[in-house]
Interface confidence: low
């Protein structure tokens, strides 16, 4: 299980990654682009009942497949720094994006990278010293490999392997919300929101203008960035004269709670600062922007509320699919629950279980969601993203079902197609009670742990739970060990 999440000490470094319904109005009342990719991989989104274009696509497909006999497909996304150099990373270097085009496809996947944030001069300086690539484009490699949902291999990405793939590196440290340039007054630029807008503008000249669907995806801070920017992208495209491009969102591990910390701590650094405190400070420091419709719901100075998924989601026009671990490591970190390899105290254990319950509650009215009961952080650009299941359905399958569903503008509960669910939230109550969760390793020994070992390590009370379930403790342990 190489490449899977390891159970590491929190607080050492922030987690970093290595991407219907309210759509923008459309000129031509056009269809969407959900297709059963798992069973028929040709991208029919480019075929509009026109046989000539279909044959051209087949020819293009044949030509593109020809080199495969001699060499492996080039999986790399290539770096393009923004031509508009006034849209910058924190240090004033030009922002950019990595692109891998797929000529036959009218689907575009734009992925926002994650990597925490900084919210004052002190912790931004420290971030610049230790994680410069998250604040500057100066040392970015020329290419990146697409993994998970950014992979062009059908085996690794049964959902959208044939899409045009765009990876937008995170170098604004502002949860993709800022719109303030570097100046004499501001040591750093915070232009996350403007970076997204500028990338979209430049991509229009590279084929995005012919897109049917633009899926704005992101993990961690990038996932929150999706919630903050998806409607603005839709508005931009409509303003620029592309109202028929359907804009959707996919927010992975960016649905945070503004809950009470397990142990209250002063807001000294990024990872110990309570979520609300960090965002309150950040939004002022970044001149952060939030979606207009959400902003209208809160009075001046209260815009920070819109950084929290369950508050901003009901105000969004574009359909958004929410992917969130019920026991998210970043959430636990900011809540001061540090699982340091020692069995947790009872108070922590109850806090963790309650977090799962609270999170489940906030997803109740989210029409499209995938929330496994695992202790982890981020998933969609992990190579193992196809392995995790909720109620027997994998994430790529759920996304495929969502693609086909075209849920309505109010996100009212619509019955999904039989056997094709896309509201998938685990109901079992503790971390890793889902047997398909990413493998856990003991951070000291590097040893893989099975579910039973992990839960006992966490202080799971086998005796009590067995009693509640009306079974022998040994039977419950056996079930857990077998992954049931």
């Amino acid at each position: 299980s190489e490449g899977r999440k390891t159970w590491r000490r929190r607080g050492q470094q922030p987690p970093q990654p290595p991407p219907p319904p309210p759509l923008p109005q459309r000129a031509e009342v056009e269809p969407g682009a959900g297709q059963p990719v798992e069973s028929f991989p040709l991208d029919f989104t480019a075929v509009e009942g026109n046989m000539d274009s279909f044959m051209a696509q087949v020819k293009s497909l044949a030509q593109s497949l020809y080199p495969c006999s001699a060499q492996q497909l080039n999986e790399d996304l290539r770096l393009h720094l923004l031509l508009n150099t006034s849209v910058t990373c924190n240090d004033g270097s030009p922002a950019g994006y990595y692109l891998k085009e797929s000529k036959g496809s009218r689907r575009w996947l734009l992925f926002l990278e994650g990597g925490w944030y900084c919210f004052n001069r002190e912790n931004c300086d420290s971030r610049y010293d230790t994680m410069r690539r998250l604040m500057s484009s100066k040392d970015w490699p020329h290419t990146r490999t697409g993994t998970g949902i950014l992979s062009s291999q059908p085996e690794e990405n049964p959902h959208w392997w044939n899409a045009n793939m765009v990876f937008i590196p995170y170098c604004s440290s502002d949860v993709w919300s800022g719109a303030s340039p570097k100046s004499d007054k501001n040591e750093y630029a915070f232009m996350g929101s403007l970076i997204i807008q500028e990338v979209v503008r430049e991509l229009l000249g590279k084929g995005l203008s012919g897109a049917k669907v633009l899926l704005l995806a992101g993990s961690s801070a990038g996932g929150t960035g999706v919630l903050l920017n998806v409607d603005r992208v839709a508005e931009l495209l409509e303003e620029l004269g592309y109202p028929s491009i359907q804009v959707r969102g996919l927010a992975d591990s960016g649905w945070f709670l503004d809950n009470k910390q397990y142990r209250r701590s002063d807001c000294i650094d990024t990872i110990n600062c309570a979520p609300t405190d960090a965002i309150r400070r950040g939004i002022r420091y970044w001149s952060g922007m939030v979606p207009e419709r959400c902003q209208r719901q809160f009075k001046e100075g209260e815009e920070w509320n819109c950084f929290f998924g369950y508050k901003v989601y009901p105000t969004l026009r574009c359909p958004v699919f929410v992917v969130q671990w019920l026991f998210d490591e970043a959430q636990l970190t900011v809540d001061n629950v540090h699982l340091t390899g020692q069995p947790v105290q009872e108070g922590q254990w109850l806090y963790i279980q309650n977090l799962g319950r609270e999170l489940r509650g906030t997803l109740k009215d989210v029409q499209a969601s995938f929330a496994p009961a695992c202790l982890s952080h981020e998933i969609i650009i992990r190579s193992y993203w196809t392995d995790v299941q909720v109620k027997g359905t994998s994430l790529p399958r759920a996304l495929h079902c969502w693609d086909r569903s075209f849920h309505d503008s109010h996100k009212a509960s619509k019955t999904p197609m039989k056997g094709c669910p896309f509201h998938l939230v685990d109901s079992c109550p503790w971390p890793h009670c889902n047997p398909s969760c990413p493998t856990i390793r003991d951070q000291f020994t590097g040893q893989e742990m099975n579910v039973a070992q992990f839960l006992m390590h966490m202080g799971f009370d086998v005796q009590t739970v067995a009693q509640q379930q009306g079974m022998e403790p040994s039977k419950l342990l056996g079930m857990l060990s077998n992954g049931n």
């Epitope: 309210p22 009342v29 959900g34 009942g49 409509e238 419709r293 309505d408 503008s409």
Partner: antibody, heavy 119, light 111 residues
Framework: EVQLVESGGDLVKPGGSLKLSCAAS????????MHWLRQAPEKGLEWVAY????????SYANTMKGRFTISRDNAKKTLSLQMTSLRSEDTAIYYC????????????WGTGTTVTVSS | DIVLTQSPASLVVSLGQRATISCRAS??????????MHWYQQKPGQPPKLLIY???NLESGVPARFSGSGSGTDFTLNIHPVEEGDATTYYC?????????FGSGTKLEIK
């Protein structure tokens, strides 16, 4: 309650003009594309015109192009249809309807306003 | 323009039985797994009311007695069991491309 209410229907002579209005309430009007549709007496439904949420896209049925103009005022939550060079075949009940974000169907309809073109 | 042919023009069904209305498009209205066909009910003196969208999705608040199916060019609206209040006119509409067009309607009578 989500509601659309049309007004402005009247009896008008052939070649005349008329402006129809549609007042929206109960939803964020500025988020939705809007349509005008019509129904001649004892006849079926016919699409007239479409305007996108920000007025960037306007579209008309062929027989109405050049004679009808669709517009909206998001601040006032109103949709309008300016009709000129009216013909007897334009006699109908005119409905405004909200376009659902996905799929192009009409999920909210007004009650209609009657336009009669006759000499 | 895509022409929708609705049949039958009128239909008489016994109370509690099944009513089936068909709609055929001159060109496919399905694409990429979606079928852009919708069904409306219109009672005299009232505007149309959305029943089914995207071929088979029941609009919220509409009784489960109504169901839709089909793809490509052939679509069906089923009402079962039929109730007295269902006696009115039904229209299909496509939104595959502009202009959206409607079928000529089916008048349902209950005996």
């Amino acid at each position: 309650e989500v509601q659309l209410v049309e007004s402005g229907g009247d009896l008008v002579k052939p070649g005349g003009s008329l402006k129809l209005s549609c007042a929206a309430s109960g939803f964020t009007f500025s988020d939705y594309g809007m349509h005008w549709l019509r129904q001649a007496p004892e006849k079926g439904l016919e699409w007239v015109a479409y305007i996108s949420s920000g007025s960037t896209t306007l579209s008309y049925a062929n027989t109405m192009k050049g004679r009808f103009t669709i517009s909206r005022d998001n601040a006032k939550k109103t949709l309008s249809l300016q009709m000129t060079s009216l013909r007897s075949e334009d006699t109908a009940i005119y409905y405004c309807a909200r376009k659902n974000y996905n799929g192009g169907y009409f999920d909210v309809w007004g009650t209609g306003t009657t336009v009669t073109v006759s000499s | 323009d895509i022409v929708l042919t609705q049949s039958p023009a009128s239909l008489v069904v016994s109370l509690g039985q099944r009513a089936t209305i068909s709609c055929r498009a001159s060109k496919s209205v399905s694409e990429s797994g979606y079928s852009y066909m919708h069904w409306y009910q219109q009672k005299p003196g009232q505007p149309p009311k959305l029943l089914i969208y995207l071929a088979s999705n029941l609009e919220s608040g509409v009784p489960a007695r109504f169901s839709g199916s089909g793809s490509g060019t052939d679509f069906t609206l089923n009402i079962h069991p039929v109730e007295e209040g269902d006696a009115t006119t039904y229209y299909c509409q496509h939104s595959r491309v502009l202009p959206p067009t409607f079928g000529s309607g089916t008048k349902l009578e209950i005996k």
